[in-house]
Interface confidence: medium
């Protein structure tokens, strides 16, 4: 037997109490999938966090970072301090990259120079806290 | 026991105005979310506008933005809709809704009342 349930679109819910009539989705939830029998509470972009898409009665809300910021995570599940680059964000903030290392985004840890004598090769432009070194013949 | 009680519903030609009351008891309209939703002849249920949260923020559907007002009066334990420049789309049963949060982070409508019934005709 089929579940009337199963008729509901998405943007409603099943509603038990009400002979499973499908019932809009109250403002500020959504249900992106047909037979629900709740709707999902929307996320609130709020704070450090800035809504990037507005909820619908189909779809959840997106949000993204404040300028000075960038996301993290899946679906942008945190913000994170941006840094200047030859930068690193450490508990104490934002922190110069150390001698032989370098950082050319706002985000991301400092990393260490190439070591051009690996590959049997010469500086040819040295490294600064921006920019990594650049190896030569 | 929660009980939603609708009025103020009746014929009116387009254009016109109309103030449906919801009166509540079982609970404190100013310390939930509340709204109107409506179903016309041979249609689904429709959510007309809410009043949300202690700071009373309001949301309308697209469909009668500009021309329904929602209010409440906390004294009165009562929820109001202002109906304005109404037209013969909006002829249906209104219903008074009371949201309902559930533990895995739904929502659902509370629909207690039996509505009242809004008629634009000439």
């Known amino acids: 037997l089929q579940d009337p349930c199963s008729n509901c679109p998405a943007g409603t819910f099943c509603d038990n109490n009400r002979n499973q009539i499908c019932s809009p989705c109250p403002p500020n939830s959504f249900s992106s999938a047909g037979g629900q029998r709740t709707c999902d509470i929307c996320r609130q972009c709020k704070g450090v966090f800035r809504t990037r898409k507005e909820c619908s009665s189909t779809s959840n809300a997106e949000c993204d970072c404040t300028p000075g910021f960038h996301c993290l995570g899946a679906g942008c599940s945190m913000c994170e301090q941006d840094c200047k680059q030859g930068q690193e964000l450490t508990k104490k903030g934002c922190k110069d990259c150390c001698f032989g290392t370098f950082n050319d985004q706002k985000r991301g840890i400092c990393r260490p120079w190439t070591n051009c004598s690996l590959d049997g090769k010469s500086v040819l432009v040295n490294g600064t806290k921006e920019r990594d070194v650049v190896c030569g013949p | 026991e929660v009980q939603l009680l609708e009025s103020g519903g009746g014929l009116v030609q387009p254009g016109g105005s109309l103030r449906l009351s919801c009166a509540a008891s079982g609970f404190t309209i100013s310390a939930e979310d509340v709204g109107w939703v409506r179903q016309a002849p041979g249609k689904g249920l429709e959510w007309v506008s809410a009043i949300l949260d202690s700071g009373g923020s309001t949301y309308y559907a697209e469909s009668v933005k500009g021309r329904f007002t929602i209010s409440r009066d906390n004294a009165k334990n009562t929820l109001y809709l202002q109906m304005s420049s109404l037209r013969a789309e909006d002829t249906a049963v209104y219903y008074c809704?009371?949201?309902?949060?559930?533990?895995?982070?739904?929502?659902?409508?509370?629909?207690r009342g039996q509505g009242t019934q809004v008629t634009v005709s000439s």
């Open positions: 809704a009371r949201y309902v949060y559930h533990a895995g982070g739904g929502v659902t409508f509370d629909l």
